[in-house]
């Protein structure tokens, strides 16, 4: 409807630059709504050019605000199902006009870009897009090209006779996989491509295409040097070469056919219809996802852009899949956020790509005092007394084996375990019998010490229970606090990176 | 001229609220990702949070140390990112910049936020 | 959070004289950092990015180096407007974060 510049913007703006007449060309490109990003590099469910611009010329003290706008529709043939969601792309173009060094020179005025939802056969949408101060009003919708029908325009089916195949030449048809594709009424030879027909022995031509069968492409600008003009109502015909022959692309950009014209793939630096264009600054904006513009600083230099993590391509504007770098180490699973990669680990793995192995001595030690021992590949705690489990962390009862001898009685104690012994027994676990009458001690004192006095013996027994008890408890109490501590940074790593994971997810 | 002019700051009581507001001129602003970053009396840089474009649905990402009070948004025709920053503490006491891009290319002058009894 | 820390904290050199300026990450970080100058009073700019590569306008005197987690800004010789205060930044993993920034002071 209109392209000008945006209301409250002081002094309406002429797209020509003061620099003589410019013509105002709109490109409308048509992507796959299913990525976030809705930029990558190809227009893959098509794209147009606005024909038929009238030249704008900026006479002093005109407003600016009505330019005149190419007349009538821009059509986007599209060939598959109708996907309901997509992305619009809508860049203005200016074409400077007149003695230019090197002939006309083409600027991005503006692009605007945005995710639809729309299903075809519905009525126009209206809409205005603001981009830096130019705005943009302009409608669209979907419609479908008979044969096809239907919100998704899907090719006109009928229902299965047999459920497991088609009739003869038929093919399942590709929405419906329960239908099958009606039987050609079209006249023998026309295009399935580019021709549809409503009547019998009919072949009608998409937009794009002409002559008996729609095989020969329409050229979307006025016929140049050896093209044969058509009739008035089809444009240009092109006998035989295809859209890409010649390469039209310049400064090393490469072509591919779009239903029926052609696109350019510019290498980066260079933008336009056929990348003859350098004239975007850095200043415009053109590096996708907070790519870092460098260069670029005047229309007549090239830009870079240095990508974000994640994403390539010369404007940043494909995503990378960087979990198929398999950055997670010992099976962790990659989850690829965007903004930063995160692996998932496996039990037994830690750290930022799950390279510490915790079955390891090196990695998590064993809890509640207990000693790492490693052999044959695998990690194995030895616990202290009163902890069992794998890593120590269950409390096991130390008086569940019955280490007390001769009717001695177990008493569990935060170290250990405590013997009281029978009457006429010593000895940690009362395994000393002691005579009555004060004589030696049997079975199992050392020999040195038989003919000693039994009271000195108890006593020399007593300190040496103590000194053990306390080496024990301060030894429990050293590893306790040590491998806590190293516990402690490891699960708080841990929680920190799941908590992470489940915040980024969410955002 | 890339110009990021920032302005809103001033003193605030804690618990209070203040609206800074970040005007750009000589770039296409509708394609630029902003941040805002502080930077405390005397400290480093904080990333503060970042709105992308309309494009991405206007997503915004926050530091942990605002997330929940801090608010960003931004108007494409008016050229303005906001930074809506409520129930603000004493640590909350920085210079204030707006910044472009994933990488930080152009800076604001940047405007001062006092947070004070 | 990656942290990133700076050293040395100030470092006192005459005009004309070399600077090396060194950064170090807590986990690998590639060459996703990038080095602001900053002058009292003034916003920080934008130096080095991608670890070694000079943003527009940059002289040459400035370079960066590094990869993984060790990182180095050097300036070839002082001239009189490069005494500022230098961060390094990591773009790695999001959130970015800042080093906490070497002095380079005049001696």
């Known amino acids: 409807h209109s392209f000008g510049p945006g209301p409250g913007l002081g002094t309406p703006r002429s797209p020509c630059n003061a620099r003589g007449p410019c013509r105002l060309f709109f490109r409308v490109c048509l992507k796959p709504g299913v990525s976030q990003e809705a930029t990558e590099s190809l227009c893959a469910l098509g794209a147009a050019l606005s024909t038929s611009v009238p030249v704008y010329t900026e006479h002093p003290g005109e407003s600016a605000a009505a330019l005149p706008l190419p007349d009538g529709l821009v059509r986007v043939p599209f060939r598959d199902a109708w996907p309901g969601t997509f992305s619009l792309v809508i860049e203005t173009w200016r074409e400077q006009l007149g003695e230019h060094a090197g002939g006309p020179a083409w600027n991005l005025l503006a692009r605007v870009v945005g995710r639809r939802r729309l299903a075809a056969g519905g009525p126009w949408a209206r809409d205005v897009q603001r981009t830096g101060t130019w705005e943009l009003h302009f409608s669209y919708r979907a419609r479908c090209e008979p044969p096809a029908v239907g919100a998704a325009c899907a090719r006109l089916c009928r229902s299965r006779s047999a459920p497991s195949r088609c009739g003869p030449g038929l093919r399942p048809c590709t929405p419906f996989p329960d239908e099958c594709e009606a039987p050609s009424v079209c006249r023998p030879g026309c295009s399935p491509e580019h021709g549809y027909c409503e009547e019998p022995d009919e072949c009608r031509c998409l937009e794009g295409w002409t002559g008996p069968l729609c095989t020969v492409p329409v050229s979307t600008s006025s016929c140049l040097n050896s093209r044969v003009p058509g009739p008035a109502s089809t444009g240009c015909l092109l006998p035989g070469p295809g859209p890409c022959d010649g390469n039209p692309c310049a400064n090393g950009g490469s072509c591919s056919e779009t239903s029926g014209s052609f696109e350019c793939a510019c290498p980066r630096g260079f933008y336009g219809l056929r990348c003859e264009v350098s004239g975007v600054t850095c200043a415009d904006g053109p590096c996708f996802n907070g790519g870092l513009c460098v260069g670029g600083e005047d229309p007549d230099s090239a830009y870079v852009c240095h990508c974000p993590p994640g994403f390539q391509g010369s404007n940043c504007e494909k995503r990378v899949d960087r979990c198929s770098l398999q950055p997670c180490q010992n099976g962790g699973l990659c989850l690829d956020l965007g903004h930063a990669l995160r692996c998932r680990c496996r039990a037994g793995f830690a750290g930022p790509r799950c390279e510490h192995d915790l079955d390891d001595c090196a990695g998590r030690a064993c809890a509640n005092g207990g000693t790492c021992v490693e052999g044959g590949g695998s990690r194995r705690c030895s616990c202290a007394l009163g902890f069992g489990g794998r890593d120590c962390r269950e409390r096991a009862d130390p008086c569940a084996s019955r280490p007390c001898a001769h009717g001695g009685r177990c008493y569990a104690h935060f170290s250990g375990l405590v013997c009281a012994c029978a009457p006429g027994y010593m000895g940690v676990r009362c395994e000393f019998a002691v005579r009555p009458d004060g004589a030696d001690a049997v079975p199992a004192a050392p020999r040195g010490l038989r003919q000693a006095d039994p009271q000195r013996f108890l006593a020399g027994v007593i300190a040496v229970i103590v000194v053990v008890v306390i080496a024990i408890v301060a030894g429990i109490v050293v590893l306790v606090i040590s491998r806590k501590k190293r516990m402690a940074k490891y699960e708080k790593a841990e929680i920190k990176e799941m908590g992470e994971m489940h915040r980024e997810l969410n955002a | 001229e890339v110009q990021l002019v920032e302005s809103g700051g001033g003193l605030v009581k804690p618990g209070g609220s203040l609206r800074l507001s970040c005007a750009a001129s000589?770039?296409?602003?509708?394609?630029?990702?902003m941040n805002w970053v502080r930077q405390a009396p005397e400290k480093g840089l904080e990333w503060v949070g970042q709105?992308?474009?309309?494009?991405?649905?206007?997503?915004?990402h926050y530091a942990e140390s605002v997330k929940g009070r801090f608010t960003i948004s931004r108007e494409d025709s008016k050229n303005t990112v906001y930074l809506q920053m409520n129930s603000l503490k004493t640590e909350d006491t920085a210079v204030y910049y707006c910044?472009?891009?994933?990488?930080?290319?152009?800076w604001g002058q940047g405007t001062t936020v006092t947070v004070s009894s | 959070n990656i942290v990133l820390t700076q050293s040395p904290a100030t470092l006192s050199l005459s005009p004309g004289e070399r600077a090396t300026l060194s950064c170090k990450a807590s986990?690998?970080?590639?060459?996703?950092v990038s080095w602001f100058q900053q002058k009292p009073g003034q916003s920080p700019r934008l130096l080095i990015y991608g670890a070694s590569n000079r943003y527009t306008g940059i002289p040459a005197r400035f370079s960066g180096s590094g990869s993984g987690t060790d990182f180095t800004l050097t300036i070839s010789s002082l001239e009189p407007e490069d005494f500022a205060v230098y961060y390094c930044?990591?773009?790695?993993?999001?959130?970015?974060?800042f080093g906490g920034g070497t002095k380079v002071e005049i001696k």
């Open positions: 986990e690998n970080v590639g060459t996703y």
């Open positions: 000589g770039i296409t602003f509708s394609n630029f990702w």
């Open positions: 709105i992308r474009l309309k494009s991405d649905d206007y997503a915004t």
């Open positions: 930044g990591q773009f790695y993993s999001f959130p970015s974060t």
């Open positions: 910044t472009t891009g994933y990488y930080f290319d152009y």
